[in-house]
């Protein structure tokens, strides 16, 4: 049997399989030792017993997508049954007071492979032996402590298969510069050891793609705003805007980014290279924010053109290699190409409240001569639209340790002038964090007051 | 002269539904928050529901969470309380009120029987 | 059971000073204004004190509102015949979430 065979149906183009080499991966026309890896069907019933007290999963992700030439990570974790885990020396042992369907196991291990290793024999002096092979029959790499890793991952995809000796967690990087753009699939089959050969345990796939647009995200922030993730905001209030580019792999650190805003709002184009930018929108309504990335990225150089045909003989103007047409290609060239990213986002423009401000405040006299706890009024004032929730929380002077959160719906008028009592149970200095807030808005405002004792000639301070 | 007109109210079997309204007049309906309020006969006040000037918040009594809704529309000036599942206890005058923190003017109610 | 506590009843002959109290917890008076409302036979409440002790124009200065910790009171001087109605009180109560009224005071005027 050759790998495509084994490891999946979907058979790329032979374009694709002639072309589109990946460094350090191998053709899928090669073929596979079944003695040493055995191949089973969907639905077999020899899956059930392939693993010691269940199945084992396997879980594929990658950090797709992937702007074409940089590197896409792909990362494999292996889930084992409940109660077990993989040690130190990569066995597989139960953990300790856990029970699962068969109760508490008196054997430790589930697999013991390092006591397998130690019994085998048939191995020359370099460790090296005919079982110590991959699928395809190239030896292992001896890595130190190499026999620790007693799982086998083939990756299989775009009619090429890479293969890893790994413990219960590979990961493998992939440059995609010879990759075609778009979704491609990514297969894995789990191989374990088992004496001599190997007993497959999971096979698991996954969606990556790649792209020649940058991938592009925005993150929007303003103060007041009650809910950054419904892309409503204030009016009268700066947004600002964060652009973060998908670039795991760091392909874009040397390029320089340039970030083209449409804020939808008649106020024109706005071009930088920094990637946050504030903008405010003094208007209510619905706009179209539009974001254009361009980067100059490493990529493939255009072919060079072909040279003149002088139509008679001309003297050469100086030595060999001076031509500078000989000089626009040369072996190791680095040649840029300019890659571009979008963003669009509706944003709603609504009225908010923007600003609250403690005007004063003010000890209530109680009717009792020596009442336990002091009545404080604060008298606040606010900007913008009419809020119908006040919270004040209550806390020690470092503002840090709550001592108590009171919310309740105010009616305000359109002057916005109200006053908040609140309890204060025993003299000192409390840190007052008080906000106002409607729908879409909550505004802060917080201040420092210092209650006395209950000694009716002690004035009430704002702390500084 | 600030006027709150409830109407809606009836009999309505068990498990019915029964739509409240409340027209308002003689202040700005849109910028301030309304709320309901009930009281059973021979009974002392029990708040219903509360709701914000723009209609973006809205609060409940537990004893009618989940059945009751609040609504308004600023265009006709009009507060509005669905009733579904009723119960015989949710029997008694329904009062519109205005405001929320305290309910500084009060409609003549209408009465919600719940009988079969 | 209300979440505030009211009397059931008061009463006092004209003239006199009646005092109807209102005792809650530090999540409704203690931390939020307090409210009353009278409600003559046969007709919708009508608010009396707002904001603890403020009187909305058109209530007369016999009525009087005061608040200590988390205990509040109504008190009328130079009670009257048509004095005689329910009084509720009523606050916010922040860890609830919901509007809480008293079970209400019967005020009767003797005499």
């Known amino acids: 049997k050759r790998f495509h065979d084994v490891l999946g149906n979907e058979r790329p183009s032979a374009y694709m399989r002639e072309h589109n080499q990946l460094n350090g991966w191998s053709s899928d026309e090669n073929d596979w030792n079944e003695k040493l890896y055995p191949v089973w069907k969907r639905g077999d019933m020899r899956w059930k017993n392939s693993w010691k007290g269940g199945r084992v999963q396997a879980v594929l992700t990658s950090d797709s997508p992937a702007l074409v030439g940089s590197n896409i990570t792909f990362a494999v974790n292996l889930i084992f049954p409940r109660c077990q885990k993989e040690d130190a020396n990569g066995n597989i042992v139960y953990e300790k007071n856990c029970r699962n369907e068969a109760g508490l196991s008196a054997d430790p291990y589930v697999y013991n492979w390092t006591a397998w290793s130690e019994d085998s024999d048939g191995e020359n002096g370099t460790g090296q032996s005919h079982h110590n092979v991959f699928p395809d029959g190239k030896p292992f790499p001896h890595h130190p402590g190499w026999r620790r890793w007693n799982f086998i991952y083939v990756f299989h995809t775009l009619g090429q298969y890479f293969q890893k000796l790994g413990r219960c967690s590979v990961r493998v990087s992939v440059n995609t510069a010879n990759v075609t753009l778009g979704p491609q699939l990514m297969e894995v089959t789990v191989y374990r050891r088992h004496g001599r050969a190997y007993v497959p345990i999971a096979q698991v796939k996954d969606v990556y793609v790649v792209t020649d647009q940058i991938p592009v995200f925005v993150t929007m922030f303003q103060k007041n705003d009650r809910n950054s993730s419904d892309e409503t905001f204030l009016k009268d209030l700066p947004i600002m805007f964060d652009v973060l580019i998908h670039d795991p792999s760091h392909f874009l650190n040397y390029s320089t980014i340039n970030y083209k805003w449409s804020f939808g709002d008649n106020t024109g184009l706005f071009v930088s290279t920094n990637h946050t930018v504030n903008h405010t929108y003094v208007l209510n309504g619905t706009f179209s924010l539009n974001l254009t990335v361009k980067a100059a990225a490493p990529g493939p150089c255009p072919p060079p053109p072909p040279p003149p045909r002088p139509s008679k003989p001309t003297p050469s103007l100086g030595p060999a290699g001076d031509n500078p047409l000989e000089l626009s290609r040369i072996p190791d060239e680095n040649c840029q190409i300019n890659r571009y990213g979008h963003f669009q986002a509706t944003i709603t423009i609504v009225e908010g409240i923007l600003e609250v401000n403690i005007i004063q405040m003010t000890d209530v006299l109680m009717p009792v001569p020596w009442p336990e706890s002091s009545l404080i009024d604060f008298v606040v004032t606010c900007q913008g639209s009419i809020p119908t929730e006040v919270c004040t929380i209550i806390s020690d002077p470092t503002c840090e340790i709550t001592q108590n959160t009171v919310c309740s719906p105010v009616d305000v008028d359109e002057m916005c002038l109200l006053t908040v009592r609140r309890t204060f149970n025993g003299s000192g200095t409390y840190c007052v964090n008080l906000t106002l807030g409607d729908d879409t808005s909550l505004a802060l405002t917080s201040t420092l007051i210092s209650v006395p004792d209950r000694d009716p000639a002690s004035p009430l301070r704002m702390a500084n | 002269e600030v006027q709150l007109l409830e109407s809606g109210g009836g009999l309505v079997q068990p498990g019915g539904s029964l739509r409240l309204s409340c027209a308002a007049s003689?202040?700005?309906?849109?910028?301030?928050?309304m709320s309901w309020v009930r009281q059973a006969p021979g009974k002392g006040l029990e708040w219903v529901s509360s709701?914000?000037?723009?209609?973006?918040?809205?609060y409940y009594a537990d004893s009618v969470k989940g059945r009751f809704t609040i609504s308004r529309d600023n265009s006709k000036n009009t507060l509005y309380l669905q009733m579904n599942s009723l119960r015989a206890e949710d029997t008694a005058v329904y009062y519109c009120?205005?405001?929320?923190?305290?309910?500084?003017?009060w409609g003549q109610g209408t009465l919600v029987t719940v009988s079969s | 059971q209300s979440v505030l506590t009211q009397p059931p009843s008061a009463s006092g002959t004209p003239g006199q000073r009646v005092t109807i109290s209102c005792s809650g917890s530090?999540?409704?008076?203690?931390?939020?204004?307090v409210s009353w409302y009278q409600q003559l036979p046969g007709t919708a409440p009508k608010l009396l004190i707002y904001?603890?002790?403020q009187r909305p124009s058109g209530v007369p200065d016999r009525f009087s509102g005061s608040k200590s910790g988390t205990s509040a009171s109504l008190a009328i001087s130079g009670l009257r015949s048509e004095d005689e109605a329910d009084y509720y009180c009523?606050?916010?109560?922040?860890?609830?979430?919901?509007?809480?009224f008293g079970g209400g005071t019967k005020l009767t005027v003797l005499g």
């Open positions: 530090s999540s409704n008076i203690g931390n939020n204004y």
């Open positions: 009120a205005r405001k929320w923190s305290t309910f500084d003017y």
């Open positions: 003689g202040f700005t309906f849109r910028k301030l928050n």
């Open positions: 009523g606050a916010w109560d922040s860890s609830l979430n919901a509007y809480v």
């Open positions: 904001a603890d002790s």
């Open positions: 709701i914000s000037h723009s209609g973006g918040s809205k």
